[in-house]
Each structure stands twice: as C-alpha cells, then as structure tokens.
C-alpha cells in the first residue's frame, strides 16, 4: 500500500484509482473496467479491427499500435498535407502517386511505364514480354525458340535483344538479290572448292558438299596416321613412303634407322622435292649397305628377306618419285657404288639405253608407259653392289623342267653349295608397273668378276616369294653370251637382276646345259 492511497500492484499499461483498485490506460482494456487483483491484465485494443469505429477513409490503411493506431496512405498514394499519419477520415488527404513521372527508369530499358491508381504497369516494347516472376520486368522474346519458325529453312535464326535475324548457314550465301539478315533471307550452298574458300591441305583434293566441303587424299596418297580422310583437316602422305617400312619380324637397329630416314623424307614430301628425295634415299641405302651393322648378324634367310624387301620397296619408291621429275636424263652415284640412271620423257618411239659403270640396259620406250596414263614415261636402272652382302648364299630355284633335266644327267652336282654372285645386283623399273610380260625383251650387259673356267654362268632375277623373302630364278631370262668379265642377258620382264656362277662343271658341248641358256 502506498501512503498516498494508491495501489502499487497495478498491472502493466494500467494506473491506480485508489489504494485497492486500478484502471487500464487508454487504448488498453481488461476483463472488468476496475482491476482489483494483480492477476488481471490490460490488453491492447485493436482500433483497426473490422468492427472498430475507426475509419481512415479511402486510399489509406489503418495501422494498429500499442495503445493506439495510425492512419497511413496506402502504397502508391501519398498525403497532400505532407503529414505521414492521421487519425480519421476527415484528416485524410491521400491521393495517387504517379510513379512513372517520379522514376522514368522504373520499367528499365525495354518497357514503357503506365500509371494506374495506386500503382503502375510496364508495357513491353516489341520483341519483349513481361517476365512471369516479375511482372514489372520486360525480357527479350526468343523468336527462334518460340515455335514461330520465322526464318527460311536455308537460313538459321539468330536471336537478338528485342529482335532476330535470319542468317545464311555456314557454307551458304544469299541467293542473288536476297539480303542476309531480314526474315525474307533465302540462301544457297557456296561451292568452297571452286571459289577458293576452302582450307584443304595441298596433299588433298577439295570436294564440295551441301553447306560445306571435305578434303580427300589425292590419288596415290593416304591419310596421315591418326587423321581421318574426308575431313576439313585431312592431311595425307604419299603412299610411296608409307608402305615402305621395315619387314615384320626383323630386328635390326641399322635397318630401323634407314627406314626412319625414309619416313622423315616422306613426311614433308612435295612433288618438287622428288630429285632431292631420290638422291637422299639412295644415299641412305648406299650407307646402309656399306655398313650393314647388325644386319650381318641376322640369319641368312632373314638377310634375304631384308634384301627382298629393300629391292621391292626401292623399285616402288623410285617409280613413284620419278613421275614428279622433269624431262631429261639423270645419273647419280654414291661412295659405296650405288648408282642410278633415269630417263624421263614424254613418250617417244625409240629405244632407250641407260649406261652405268657395271651395267647397260636397253629397251623400247613404248614399254615404259601404261596406256591411258597421262604422266611422263620413266625408265630407270639402279646398280646396288652392296646388296650382294645380303644376298650371299641366296638359293637358285630353276624351272621344274630345267631342274628335272639337270637332275637326270648331273645328279648331285647342284648340291655343291649356293651359286656365286658375279655381278652387281641391278634393279630396273618403268613408270608402268605392269612389267611381268614385256612386249619386247629388255637387254642387260653386265660387267663382272672373272668366271672360273668350266663354271656355268646364269642370268637370273630376284623372285619375291610368297613369304616376303625370295630366291634367284631364271624364268623369262636367257643368257645371250658371256665372256670372261661380261655377260649379256635378255629378259621378258623387269625386276632385280644379276649374273650368277653355278657350282658345277660344264661338259664340253653338253646339250643338256644349253637348256639353261
């Protein structure tokens, strides 16, 4: 109890009436008007409640506060009087705010602001629409994906901000008179090949395709390892080189190094480099055969396989490269005795003679060219004395009828070891690779070591066997005549040739042995 007669226990938001009673403050109410016990409370009266007598008037909102209330203008409206709050309708001066005037950038870049009572809307510019999640924000309409298909099928649609373009597809161009961009654009395929707009490598030929182009290897060329054919970035290499690789199953560092050189020469090969490339290959071969290194430690049969592979490949490579030479006669010789003679001509009707240190070859020009082949005619002769090392003890396989005849009359005499190579090994080739049956024979004159008296001299060629190796054979070759250090041979095909000395005695006037000649 207060000495002044006022209760000290009055609840919050109340005041004492006397020493035993309290009353709620204005804006608060309790269960009974006079509070006589401390357990009672004073609660805020919500003047803004629906049944309340308070009326703020139009364009305004009532805001309840602790023990009171405020009238405020609704969003989008403001009081003319400037007073932010008021208590009743008579004090209400709320009127609409023109947001568009207040903030001209309200609709950002792509909309026009339109004022409404208490608010505003954004009217989007052509090519824009209101964003569903933010109806005040205009966003670009993608005409290309909206299903309108506004462009011709020969073009592709490019969406722009607020617009779109119909552009020619890559590899296409506007048809004459057509623009490139508006929705009436119509395009046609560009022939990149004839217009020179392609990026094909010089090792390929350009082929136009609809809307694009592809690059295909030139005839006689193949795609570089790992690069597909018929692509824009196809790069090819001359098959002349790519097929001449070490024979399978032969392990020789010396041989690998030779073939590495061949592949290096082929990597950036161009037709204009033919002369230098031929010389470099023969230089490398000359060095290989001068110092065969670990090739000499291989079993004899493997050495014969290597020789066979080298002879076969060399012929193909020289034939391929020679077609890129200009007309004329070429002669190259190398330290270890390798020699090349080449004649390149537009086809002429005469015989050709190629002369070398140890061999001469004569044949008709008309053999050189395959009919219908537009390239130049090439006749070539390579002497490869170093090949003799690899062909030591190579077998001689006679035709069955010759073999049988000899077997009947000279039993056991041919078992007397392998024939001896008397001459350099030579390889003859033409631009025409179909040389298995010449229409007129080729004549070779070999210079060679002295013949041991009463030994048989044979004109032979190297026959590449099915197994990739080979042997000496006489089929299609005949010995026209022989002196102590020279022999004339005539053959009806081209390959690699030599003169052998057979290991048996020749009987005087032996009719059987004349069969061989």
């Amino acid at each position: 109890q207060d000495s002044r007669g006022c209760a000290r226990w009055c609840p919050q938001d109340s005041s004492c009436v006397n020493a035993t009673a309290c009353r709620c403050n204005p804006g608060f109410s309790s269960f009974s008007e006079i509070i006589t016990t401390p357990m009672e409370t004073c609660d805020d009266i919500n003047e803004c409640a629906t049944l309340s007598k308070v009326s703020c008037g139009k364009f305004s909102d009532c805001w309840n506060t602790e023990g009171s209330y405020d009238c405020v203008c609704s969003p989008g409206y403001e009081p003319v009087s400037g007073a932010k709050t008021f208590k009743n309708e008579s004090e209400n001066t709320c009127q609409d705010v023109d947001e568009c005037q207040q903030n001209p950038r309200l609709c950002k870049s792509y909309g026009t602001c339109v004022n409404t009572l208490g608010s505003y809307t954004c009217q989007c510019l052509p090519g824009f629409k209101l964003k569903p999640e933010d109806p005040k924000l205009c966003t670009d309409v993608n005409e290309c994906t909206s299903g309108q298909n506004p462009c011709h099928s020969s073009t592709h649609c490019l969406n722009n901000v607020g617009s779109y373009q119909c552009r020619c597809r890559p590899g296409w161009q506007p048809i004459p008179g057509s623009p490139n961009g508006p929705n009436n654009t119509v395009c046609e395929d560009v022939d990149e090949c004839s217009s020179g707009q392609h990026q094909c490598d010089s090792s390929t030929v350009c082929f136009n395709t609809v809307g694009s182009y592809s690059c295909r290897c030139r005839p006689g060329w193949k795609p570089r390892h790992g690069i597909p054919n018929n692509q824009k970035d196809t790069v090819c290499e001359d098959m002349t080189f790519s097929t001449w690789t070490p024979p399978p199953g032969v392990h020789s560092q010396t041989l690998s190094r030779f073939f590495d050189k061949v592949q290096d020469l082929g990597r950036d090969y161009k037709p204009g480099l033919a002369n230098n490339t031929i010389q470099s290959i023969l230089q490398a071969l000359d060095e290989l055969l001068e110092a065969p290194g670990d090739l000499e430690t291989l079993p004899r049969l493997q050495q014969h396989c290597v020789a066979s592979h080298l002879l076969d490949g060399l012929e193909d490579v020289l034939r391929g490269l020679s077609k890129n030479l200009s007309n004329g006669l070429l002669n190259f010789s190398y330290p270890a005795g390798t020699e090349l003679s080449l004649e390149v001509q537009k086809q002429v009707d005469r015989s050709v003679t190629l002369r070398q240190n140890q061999a001469v070859m004569q044949l008709d020009w008309n053999q050189a060219q395959k009919s219908g082949d537009p390239g130049p005619s090439v006749v070539g002769l390579v002497s490869i004395p170093g090949m003799g090392k690899l062909l030591a003890e190579a077998p001689l396989v006679l035709e069955p009828e010759k073999q049988m005849l000899l077997h009947e009359t000279h039993q056991g005499l041919l078992q007397d070891g392998s024939p001896i190579l008397l001459s350099d090994v030579i390889s003859a080739f033409l631009s025409n690779n179909d040389t298995q049956n010449l229409s007129s024979p080729v004549t070779f004159t070999f210079s060679h070591r002295s013949v041991i008296p009463r030994q048989k001299v044979l004109c032979v060629f190297w026959e590449h066997g099915q197994n990739g190796c080979g042997h000496w054979a006489t089929t299609g070759c005949s010995t026209i005549g022989t002196r102590d250090t020279s022999t004339i041979c005539r053959c009806t095909h081209l390959s690699s040739f030599a003169v052998l000395m057979a290991h048996y005695d020749v009987q005087e006037e032996d009719p059987v042995l004349t069969v061989i000649t």
Partner: antibody, heavy 118, light 106 residues
Framework: QVQLQQSGAEVKKPGASVKVSCKAS????????MQWVRQAPGQGLEWIGA????????RHTQKFKGRVTMTADKSTSTVYMELSSLRSEDTAVYYC???????????WGQGTLVTVSS | QIVLTQSPATLSLSPGERATLTCSAS?????MHWYQQKPGLSPKRWIY???KLASGVPDRFSGSGSGTDYTFTIRRLEPEDFATYYC?????????FGQGTKVEIK
C-alpha cells in the same frame, strides 16, 4: 649461285604487325622448303615455320599459331613471313633459309632485325 | 616436340686442342645437322645428315652418332673455329635447335 635477299630492318610498336620478305635466286624455287628462324639478342636459334613455294603449304610451331602467316609468290621467287600482335619479346633477327630434310638449311638470308618498342 | 640438349654450354680451349660437342635428343632422330655462327653473322650449315661436311668445311671437322646421341668434333682447333655451334633435328615437326655451344679461346 644461290642467294636469299631479305628486306630491311623494321621498328614496330607492340600490337602491330611486321612482314619480312626473302627473295630467292640461283635455284629452282619449288625444290626446297623455305624456313623461317629467329634469334633474339644474345639468344639461340628458334624455328618459326616453313612454307613450300610450290603450293603454299606451311608448317609452324604451336607457339606462333594464329600469329604467323607465311606465303610465297612464285612469280617473283619471294617468300613472306608476317608476324602479328607483336610484343617486346618478338624483338629479334629473323632469317629465311632454304631447307630440305636430308640437307638441313644450306643457304641463309642475311637476316632482318625487327625491333618491337613502345 | 623433340628437345635437343647441347653440352657443354661453353667450351674454353686453346688453338690446336680437340673440341668435342654433344647433342642429346629427347627422342630418336634420323637427320641431325650442325651449324656454325659467328657474332653478327647468319648461321652457316657446317655438317649435315650426321656426318657429311658442307662445302668448304675443312676435314678437321667431323660428326657422328645415331638415335638420340650425336657428337661434333674439331680435331685441332684453328683460330677461325671459335664460334657458336648449334645442332638441329629434322625428324619431326616442329624442327628444333639445340641451345648452342660456344667454343671460346681459353
């Protein structure tokens, strides 16, 4: 006799381009690749690339991809090397050299000094 | 790319002495070439295809090697031989040079 005559010295600003020429004489222009090699002051030799005059085919190092253009004019037996977007580290003597795989670069131009400075 | 490492970087010798320069490749190389360069001058081809002397090169120079290891030798140094020598491979693109060996007078 074989001769390779290069264009004169150039001073360029960073970002600019330079085009160096190399006129060949005394041999068949299409029988060799023409190589481009550069040498920065006090440094070693650096291969830029090569052009084959016969068909305009080129080879170049990845380092210069997109910046170097090598061309050949058969009518004047001249090759060109253009280097764009120059930076100070492109300051060097630029050489052209006749080349073939098995022979190396057997004839060299006298060199063209390109200075890149702001 | 094939990296060529030349050693030593500098070789200090007196005239009459033997100089041996080496060039080591990160992969096997078939065609190795050597060039001589003197200050302010263009390089000159000196040895090509491992061991062949370029025209006008005296026979006191020689080259050898195969695979990844190559050697350039000057049998008896003459005053005009003091220069920088570069090896260069042509077995794969890009073509690469060694960083050079400077042969200087001791």
């Amino acid at each position: 006799q074989v001769q390779l005559q290069q264009s004169g010295a150039e001073v360029k600003k960073p970002g600019a381009s330079v085009k160096v020429s190399c006129k060949a004489s005394g041999y068949t222009f299409t029988n060799y690749w023409m190589q481009w090699v550069r040498q920065a002051p006090g440094q070693g030799l650096e291969w830029i690339g090569a052009v084959y005059p016969g068909d305009g085919d080129t080879r170049h190092t990845q380092k210069f991809k997109g910046r170097v253009t090598m061309t050949a004019d058969k009518s004047t037996s001249t090759v060109y090397m253009e280097l764009s977007s120059l930076r100070s580290e492109d300051t060097a003597v630029y050489y052209c050299a006749r080349g073939f795989t098995a022979y190396g670069m057997d004839y060299w131009g006298q060199g063209t000094l390109v200075t890149v400075s702001s | 790319q094939i990296v060529l490492t030349q050693s030593p970087a500098t070789l200090s010798l007196s005239p009459g002495e033997r100089a041996t320069l080496t060039c080591s490749a990160s992969s096997s190389v078939s065609y190795m070439h050597w060039y001589q360069q003197k200050p302010g001058l263009s390089p000159k081809r000196w040895i090509y295809d491992t061991s062949k002397l370029a025209s006008g090169v005296p026979d006191r120079f020689s080259g050898s090697g195969s695979g990844t290891d190559y050697t350039f030798t000057i049998r008896r140094l003459e005053p005009e031989d003091f220069a920088t020598y570069y090896c260069q491979q042509w077995s794969s693109n890009p073509l690469t040079f060694g960083q050079g060996t400077k042969v200087e007078i001791k």
